[in-house]
Interface confidence: low
């Protein structure tokens, strides 16, 4: 199937599971590639981006960070090193998850006579709201 880059939702509900979308399509679908991703996070009210995970060779490596331990689930491409969907779930969202996320996509493209490295960063700002506010907003 075709790859379409879709922006992530930006409003997460406290206590619920939230999917942060990161889709990075290859420019030419027929080109073979290997891709890995690193996600970084800057919590609302802080200055520093901190790496929270790396996904490479079908292995999810979580950094030590109590805000995310046991809460991050890979929801991107599976069964391939040629990742185009690099999305994650955060389960049981708390207010500590409000802030700026960066999905860093590192791709090695294999051409007939050479290899080419590319990188792109997808930026996602997430606000965590309580369920009552979310319900009121939908009225």
């Amino acid at each position: 199937g075709g790859c379409v880059e879709v922006d992530s939702e930006t409003e997460a509900v406290y206590g619920m599971t939230f999917k942060i979308l990161c889709i990075s399509c290859k420019r030419r679908s027929e080109t073979n590639a290997e891709t890995f991703t690193e996600w970084t996070f800057r919590q609302k009210g802080t200055e520093e981006f901190v790496k929270i995970l790396r996904y490479e060779n079908e292995v999810l490596q979580l950094e030590e960070d109590e805000r995310f331990e046991g809460r991050v689930v890979w929801n991107g491409s599976r069964g391939t090193k040629d990742l185009q969907d690099l999305s994650i779930f955060i389960t049981n969202v708390t207010y500590n998850h409000s802030g700026d996320y960066e999905c860093h996509v590192y791709r090695l493209l294999f051409f007939e006579n050479y290899e080419h490295n590319t990188s792109v960063v997808k930026k996602i700002h997430i606000e965590v709201v309580d369920k009552a506010n979310r319900d009121m907003a939908s009225i």
């Epitope: 520093e48 901190v50 790496k51 979580l62 950094e63 030590e64 960070d65 109590e66 805000r67 331990e69 046991g70």
Partner: nanobody, 126 residues
Framework: EVQLVESGGGLVQAGSSLSLSCAAS????????MGWFRQAPGKEREFVAR????????YYTDSVKGRFTISRDRAKDTVYLQMNSLKPEDTAIYLC???????????????????WGQGTLVTVSS
Amino acid sequence: EVQLVESGGGLVQAGSSLSLSCAASGRALSTYAMGWFRQAPGKEREFVARISRSGITTYYTDSVKGRFTISRDRAKDTVYLQMNSLKPEDTAIYLCAADASTNPAGYYLRNRYDYWGQGTLVTVSS
């Protein structure tokens, strides 16, 4: 205030195993990420291993990966360092340390740890 007490050190032969324990009085260890460091005679104190509050995430220095295992028992409020295939270069005073921060940056740095034990001596003879 947290007082940390290490135990389990001793003199062993190269290739053997030893298990170190770190217990606390004052405040529960479960509220801290815990690290083990070591200091050999005449050398800088160096990071060995770290375990997060929940016990889900661990870090090791390259020289002990595959030989040492850090773990924690929340019920006993104790942190352990299981050391296998010991080498003479593992000889040092081993100290446990408690870190209240949840930010993972610089987990191996001494100055980010809030409380330290006095240490237990591990001597590995060849």
